[in-house]
C-alpha cells in the first residue's frame, strides 16, 4: 500500500451522561486510514493534568491501513478546558501534523439554518446601485456563532458589527448583512455566508439573479427507440429542457399531437444538475400504431424565465429505408488481459438512423450498461453506421462462447432485428466471428491464405457476392457452395456459405 | 377571426407621455406571449418589448426605463406605457401576437398607432 | 444580444426570376428564425417560420432554408404582387435583443 496520512476524530460523551460530581472525566483522539505504522498523538491539556494512554494500532481489514485510539483522562475543572490533540505522522511528511481542538463533552443542540436572501431585480433584469445581501442563522440552541462572509472562497474584510441576534423561545436567529457594489455583484462571484457553531461549519451561497435572458436553455424532443417501438411495444417520447435557472416558477410542459386526439398522461422528472441549472424530463407513452402511421407529437415548454414559449415536435422520420449489416468481431487476446476480452460490432448502411443495439449471452439480453454504443454516423454513402463494444469475461466465455450482437431497425426483416454472433475462441486459428446461422465450419481465403475464418452472411450471400460451385479441395463440407465477394484493387475473399 | 386593435397614439410633445392599448380579440390573449415592434417612417422594424404568458417583460436595451409593457388578460388589452418621449419615438407602433407554441415568430399583427413627438 | 444582418438592403428582379435573400445571425439560433413580407401601408405578415415551415395561405413559390447562423429567403418565381420589403426575425426562445429582425429588403421591380 501506498503512504496514507491519518484522518484523525476527536472522541467524546454527551455532556448529559457525565455526572456533575465527576472529579475526573477521559476524552479521546482517533486517527485512522493511515499508513505505513506509526502516528505520534500527544495532548495540551492547558492548566490541568492528565494521563495520556495510546493504544496499539489495529488493521483495517478492507484497506491494510491502520487506526489507533489515544485517551486522555483529566481531573480537576475540566468542564471549561479546550483540550488539544495533536497527531503526527513522518512517514506522510516530516512535518505533518493534524490539530483537533475541544471540550470534554458534546452538548446536545440543534443547528442553525444558514439562508442568503439578496435584493431583488426589477422586471427588466436591472440591478440597483448597491445590493444587499442578508445571511439568515436561525433556528440554533443559544450559543457563541462565528458569520464570516467569503467572496468565492476568500474570507472578505466586512463589518460584522451589524450583526444583530434575537431568542425565541428557547431558539436563537442572527442576520448579517453584506452590502455590495453593483460592479462586484456583476462581476458574477460567488458569495458564501459561512457560521462556525459548536465546532461546526454552516453555509450558504449566492450569485446574482438568474440573466433574464436564459441563454443557455435548450430543449430536445426524442424520437422513440426500435427497441422500445418493435420489441417492447410500449414506445415513448421525451421532451428533456435543460440549463434552466432554478427559480420560483415552475416549467409547464404541455402535449399534444398534430391530429388533435387526446394524449397519454406523461411523467415528469426534475432535477438539480451539479453547475446549479434544472433538468426537466416529460415522458409520453405514444400508441405504436400511432407513431408508425406518421402521427406528430409537440411538447409546448413555457417558463416565466423565458420570454416566448417553446415549441418541439417529433414524427416518425421519413426518406429513404434500408436495413442494417451487421458485423460481430472478437478482438485477439491482449499481453495482461487473459480473463478479458472485448467484442465488437459493426452495424453500417442503415436508413434512417434510429436504431437500437443489444448484446445477448446465453439467450439473455445484457444490460444496456454492459455496453458502450456510438451514436449513428454518416457513412460515404447514404446510410449510417454504429459500433458498439462489449467486455465479457472469461467466466462468460467459459460458461457459454457465444455472444449475440443484435440490432433492430424499422427496416430489418421480418421482425425489425438483425443479429449475428461472436466467439471469443471460435476454435479456429486467427479467431474471429462467425455469424449465428452459419454452418459449423467456414473458411475463407483470398488467394494465398487459407483457414482464416471469417463473419459469413448467413444463408443469403452478400450483395456483391456471386455463387460458384463447391471445392473439392475445400475442407469444407462439400454441399456448401462458394461464395466469392467481387473486391476492387485486391485478391477476392472466398469464403463457403450457403448460396 | 383573430384582429388587434392598437389605440392611443397621436401628436405630444417631447418629455411627455402616451400610453398605448392593443384590444385583442378572437383568440385567447392569456395563452399568447404578446410584443410590441415599432417602425419609424421609411425605417425598418424594430422590437421594443415582449410580455410572456406569466406576464414577465423583457426590453429592448434602449427601451428599458422608459417603456413599460403590461397586460390585462380579464379585459383583453395590452399596453404600453411610454414615458419621456423624444423625436426619435416618433414611429407607427405595433401590437402582435407571437405564435401559440412560441419560438416560431408573429402570427398576427394589428394596424398599428402612429406616435409623433414633435413640440 | 444576437445581432441579425440582412443582405442584400436592395433587390431589382423581373417577374419570373428567382431572388434569394441572406440572413446571417451573430450566434446560432436553435429555433424561430422567421421571415416577413411588408408592403406600403400594411403591417408585416408572417410567410416562413421555425427557418423553413411555410405560414399558412403562403404560396409554395416562398422557401426557407438554413440553420445555426446563415438564413435564406427564396422565391422561387417572383410574382407581381412578391414586390415588397422582406424582414428576417429571429423569435429565440430564451433571447431578447435590440435587433431581432434584419435591417430589410426591398424587392423592386427592374
Known amino acids: 500500500a501506498s503512504t496514507q496520512s491519518p484522518s484523525v476524530f476527536p472522541l467524546t460523551r454527551c455532556c448529559k451522561n457525565i455526572p456533575s460530581n465527576a472529579t475526573s472525566v477521559t476524552l479521546g483522539c482517533l486517527a485512522t486510514g493511515y499508513f505505513p505504522e506509526p502516528v505520534m498523538v500527544t495532548w495540551d491539556t492547558g492548566s490541568l493534568n492528565g494521563t495520556t494512554m495510546t493504544l496499539p494500532a489495529t488493521t483495517l481489514t478492507l484497506s491494510g491501513h491502520y487506526a489507533t485510539i489515544s485517551l486522555l483522562t483529566v481531573s480537576g475543572a475540566w468542564a471549561k478546558q479546550m483540550f488539544t490533540c495533536r497527531v503526527a505522522h513522518t512517514p506522510s511528511s516530516t512535518d505533518w501534523v493534524d490539530n483537533k481542538t475541544f471540550s470534554v463533552c458534546s452538548r446536545d443542540f440543534t443547528p442553525p439554518t444558514v439562508k442568503i436572501l439578496q435584493s431583488s431585480c426589477d422586471g427588466g433584469g436591472h440591478f440597483p446601485p448597491t445590493i444587499q445581501l442578508l445571511c439568515l442563522v436561525s433556528g440554533y440552541t443559544p450559543g457563541t456563532i462565528n458569520i464570516t462572509w467569503l467572496e468565492d472562497g476568500q474570507v472578505m474584510d466586512v463589518d460584522l458589527s451589524t450583526a444583530s441576534t434575537t431568542q425565541e423561545g428557547e431558539l436563537a436567529s442572527t442576520q448579517s448583512e453584506l452590502t455590495l457594489s453593483q460592479k462586484h455583484w456583476l462581476s458574477d462571484r460567488t458569495y458564501t455566508c459561512q457560521v462556525t457553531y459548536q465546532g461546526h461549519t454552516f453555509e450558504d451561497s449566492t450569485k446574482k439573479c438568474a440573466d433574464s435572458n436564459p441563454r443557455g436553455v435548450s430543449a430536445y424532443l426524442s424520437r422513440p427507440s426500435p427497441f422500445d417501438l418493435f420489441i417492447r411495444k410500449s414506445p415513448t417520447i421525451t421532451c428533456l429542457v435543460v440549463d434552466l435557472a432554478p427559480s420560483k416558477g415552475t416549467v409547464n410542459l404541455t402535449w399534444s399531437r398534430a391530429s388533435g386526439k387526446p394524449v397519454n398522461h406523461s411523467t415528469r422528472k426534475e432535477e438539480k444538475q451539479r453547475n446549479g441549472t434544472l433538468t426537466v424530463t416529460s415522458t409520453l407513452p405514444v400508441g405504436t400504431r400511432d407513431w408508425i402511421e406518421g402521427e406528430t407529437y409537440q411538447c409546448r415548454v413555457t417558463h416565466p424565465h423565458l420570454p416566448r414559449a417553446l415549441m418541439r415536435s417529433t414524427t416518425k422520420t421519413s426518406g429513404p429505408r434500408a436495413a442494417p449489416e451487421v458485423y460481430a468481431f472478437a478482438t485477439p487476446e491482449w499481453p495482461g488481459s487473459r480473463d478479458k476480452r472485448t467484442l465488437a460490432c459493426l452495424i453500417q448502411n442503415f436508413m434512417p438512423e434510429d436504431i437500437s443495439v443489444q448484446w445477448l449471452h446465453n439467450e439473455v439480453q445484457l444490460p444496456d450498461a454492459r455496453h458502450s454504443t456510438t451514436q449513428p454516423r454518416k457513412t460515404k454513402g447514404s446510410g449510417f453506421f454504429v459500433f458498439s463494444r462489449l467486455e465479457v469475461t472469461r467466466a462468460e466465455w467459459e460458461q457459454k462462447d457465444e455472444f449475440i450482437c443484435r440490432a433492430v431497425h424499422e427496416a430489418a426483416s421480418p421482425s425489425q432485428t438483425v443479429q449475428r454472433a461472436v466467439s471469443v475462441n471460435p476454435g479456429l486459428a486467427g479467431g474471429s466471428a462467425q455469424s449465428q446461422r452459419a454452418p459449423d465450419r467456414v473458411l475463407c481465403h483470398s488467394g494465398q491464405q487459407q483457414g482464416l475464418p471469417r463473419a459469413a452472411g448467413g444463408s443469403v450471400p452478400h450483395p456483391r457476392c456471386h455463387c460458384g460451385a463447391g471445392r473439392a479441395d475445400w475442407p469444407g463440407p462439400p454441399e456448401l457452395d462458394v461464395c466469392v465477394e467481387e473486391a476492387e484493387g485486391e485478391a477476392p475473399w472466398t469464403w463457403t456459405g450457403l448460396c | 377571426q383573430v384582429q388587434l386593435v392598437e389605440s392611443g397614439g397621436g401628436l405630444v410633445q417631447p418629455g411627455g407621455s402616451l400610453r398605448l392599448s392593443c384590444a385583442a380579440s378572437?383568440?385567447?390573449?392569456?395563452?399568447?406571449?404578446m410584443t410590441w415592434v415599432r417602425q419609424a417612417p421609411g425605417k425598418g422594424l424594430e422590437y421594443v418589448s415582449i410580455?410572456?404568458?406569466?406576464?414577465?417583460?423583457w426590453y429592448a436595451n434602449w427601451a428599458s426605463g422608459r417603456f413599460t409593457i403590461s397586460r390585462d388578460n380579464s379585459k383583453n388589452t395590452v399596453y404600453l406605457q411610454i414615458d419621456s418621449l423624444r423625436a426619435e419615438d416618433t414611429a407607427t407602433y405595433y401590437c402582435?401576437?407571437?405564435?401559440?407554441?412560441?419560438?416560431?415568430?408573429?402570427?398576427?399583427w394589428g394596424q398599428g398607432t402612429l406616435v409623433t413627438v414633435s413640440s | 444580444d444576437i445581432q441579425m444582418t440582412q443582405s442584400p438592403s436592395s433587390v431589382s428582379a423581373s417577374v419570373g426570376d428567382r431572388v434569394t435573400i441572406t440572413c446571417r445571425a451573430s450566434?446560432?439560433?436553435?429555433?424561430?428564425l422567421a421571415w416577413y413580407q411588408q408592403k406600403p401601408g400594411q403591417p408585416p405578415k408572417l410567410l416562413i417560420y421555425d427557418h423553413s415551415t411555410l405560414a399558412s395561405g403562403v404560396p409554395s413559390r416562398f422557401s426557407g432554408s438554413g440553420s445555426g447562423t446563415e438564413y435564406a429567403l427564396t422565391i422561387s418565381s417572383l410574382q407581381p404582387e412578391d414586390f415588397a420589403t422582406y424582414y428576417c426575425q429571429h423569435a429565440d426562445y430564451a433571447h431578447h435583443s435590440d435587433n431581432v429582425f434584419g435591417g430589410g429588403t426591398k424587392v423592386e421591380i427592374k
Open positions: 378572437g383568440f385567447t390573449l392569456s395563452n399568447h406571449d
Open positions: 450566434q446560432s439560433i436553435y429555433s424561430g
Open positions: 402582435a401576437r407571437e405564435t401559440h407554441h412560441g419560438s416560431s415568430g408573429i402570427d398576427h
Open positions: 410580455i410572456n404568458t406569466y406576464g414577465n417583460h
